[in-house]
């Protein structure tokens, strides 16, 4: 019968011929009366056999990631008779792995959106690197992830590549962050290869800013001839949030005379001071009212940023009109 052990050849061997092992018949007594032959894909070009001894050699550099095993056939012939000594046999040469591939992030570019002020531990995104080396061969393809840029706001789970928030972020201070993640094979041991990827993390807005009047005092004038419903001026508050989080409503907080009203222009987010009832210069030539501004909608968990509405004082001077 045939005698052989499992055949392995390391990939990327630079030697011109590398001894892999020996194929022999147990009928071979070593007197050079048998001839060994190698058949199949790679026979003669990649692998050769010593016809007398059955020693097999690799004569080319192999790349496991291109081809990880070769299935060959062996024959042994009695030189004297030309007849087969053993039935033709199939055998396998496995290409063993070396750590010659760095981890690669295949889904680049990575981009994620996460709400500002999210608590620590909030999941942002998972990045995954792949390593073409053999996952069953030692640690060549066992990866560890680490953060090269992004502290103290982000962390990455070493074995999963899951990026989480590690410190609250405020969109109004910084609205996007570049995080750089490294994947290292060999679980970070000496000889490890690495790859990096960038993740753009954008913060989406939450309603953590209340509208605030730019001015604490406005001065407006109204003619005593102005009919009710007249717009006598505008007031303006600023809200650093965006979109619906910046939508605001203006209202009167104090107006003892009940002479004025404020309506909100939702296009411009301005407050329009309206004359609610006619004024008379001879009766009262100036008024003082206080206006307030609030966001349209504030979720309960964000009320701590909206404890007291901003107000402004409006001084309104009545202009005299000559009366017949």
């Amino acid at each position: 019968g045939w005698v052989w052990n499992q055949f392995f050849v390391p990939e990327e061997m630079n030697t011109t011929s590398h001894h892999i092992g020996q194929l022999r018949s147990d009928l071979d007594n070593g007197n050079n009366s048998f001839q060994y032959k190698l058949l199949g894909a790679g026979a003669g070009s990649t692998f050769i056999i010593d016809e007398r001894t059955g020693d097999i050699y690799a004569i080319q550099k192999l790349d496991r990631e291109e081809r990880s095993l070769y299935i060959l056939r062996a024959q042994v012939i009695d030189i004297a008779t030309g007849r087969a000594v053993e039935p033709e046999s199939e055998f396998v040469i496995k290409v063993s792995d070396i750590n010659d591939n760095e981890p690669k992030f295949l889904d680049e570019p990575y981009e994620a959106i996460v709400p500002e002020m999210s608590p620590e531990g909030t999941l942002v995104i998972q990045v995954t690197a792949s390593d073409a080396d053999d996952p069953s061969s030692g640690n060549n393809a066992r990866l560890l992830y680490s953060l090269l840029q992004g502290q103290p706001y982000f962390s990455v789970e070493p074995t999963t590549g899951v990026i989480r928030i590690s410190s609250k972020m405020d969109r109004e201070l910084q609205d996007e962050y570049w995080v750089i993640i490294q994947a290292k094979d060999m679980i970070g041991q000496p000889g490890a290869l690495s790859g990096t990827t960038s993740v753009l993390i954008k913060l989406s807005d939450v309603n953590d800013n209340k509208p605030i009047f730019k001015e604490s005092l406005y001065r407006l004038t109204v003619s005593e001839s102005a009919p009710t419903g007249t717009s006598i001026g505008t007031i303006m508050a600023y809200d650093n949030d965006i979109g619906e989080n910046a939508e605001m409503d203006y209202s009167i907080e104090e107006d003892d005379s009940q002479t004025f009203d404020i309506i909100t222009n939702h296009e411009t987010q301005e407050g329009i001071v309206i004359l609610k009832k006619k004024v008379d210069f001879e009766h009262q030539n100036h008024y003082g009212i206080r206006a307030k501004v609030k966001n349209h909608h504030v979720p309960e968990q964000l009320m701590k940023y909206h404890t007291e509405a901003s107000t402004t004082f409006i001084k309104i001077q009545v202009e005299d009109v000559d009366e017949p």
């Epitope: 969109r171 650093n240 940023y305």
Partner: antibody, heavy 125, light 107 residues
Framework: QVQLVESGGGVVQPGRSLRLSCAAS????????IHWVRQAPGKGLEWVAV????????YYADSVKGRFTISRDNSKNTLYLQMNSLRAEDSAVYYC??????????????????WGQGTTVTVSS | SYELTQPPSVSVSPGQTASITCSGD??????VSWYQQKPGQSPILVIY???KWPSGIPERFSGSNSGNTATLTISGTQAMDEADYYC?????????FGGGTKLTVLS
Amino acid sequence: QVQLVESGGGVVQPGRSLRLSCAASGFTFSRYGIHWVRQAPGKGLEWVAVIWYDGSNKYYADSVKGRFTISRDNSKNTLYLQMNSLRAEDSAVYYCARRAGIPGTTGYYYGMDVWGQGTTVTVSS
Amino acid sequence: SYELTQPPSVSVSPGQTASITCSGDRLGEKYVSWYQQKPGQSPILVIYQDNKWPSGIPERFSGSNSGNTATLTISGTQAMDEADYYCQAWDSSTVVFGGGTKLTVLS
């Protein structure tokens, strides 16, 4: 790292002028408004002036209005404070400080998150 | 012009809670920032927008603001917290600082 470094301080006579500089590094200078804040010896902080990220708006404390001018050169990452008609009461350590908040935000709700080490101005005859 | 008033000094024993107040007309309607300044050093922002922490500031520091008074609270006060503290607000395009409070941590 993020840094502001003031220079240009010194001893000057009343009525004379002085120009302070503030060199920024480690961040995108053109995205931030910058303040000048001063502190007289043994006293508290006093705000002096602010300039918006693009130089479009400048505001001053009443105590320096008409005498001091704040400006910036974004190509040089540098802020300036031109101080004219100096008085004894202008003697202080002058700090530049970054206004926290991205472009497009208004107001000074987010504080001053980066400060220089200060430069000393002494107005004395 | 708008004014912010702080007590000149506050004393606290180590491990106790220190409270520093800052008062101003309708201050609760505005947003307040707080700064810590140690002798010979530049100020450091410790609280902004009433109750938010800048990166790197321990959560022993907290802030609140309501009515006419904003408060900086330091829980579990340590010797290293001894410093001057300033409140700051914004009014009509100008910045206003309080007069400062010297926090003494009793030994």
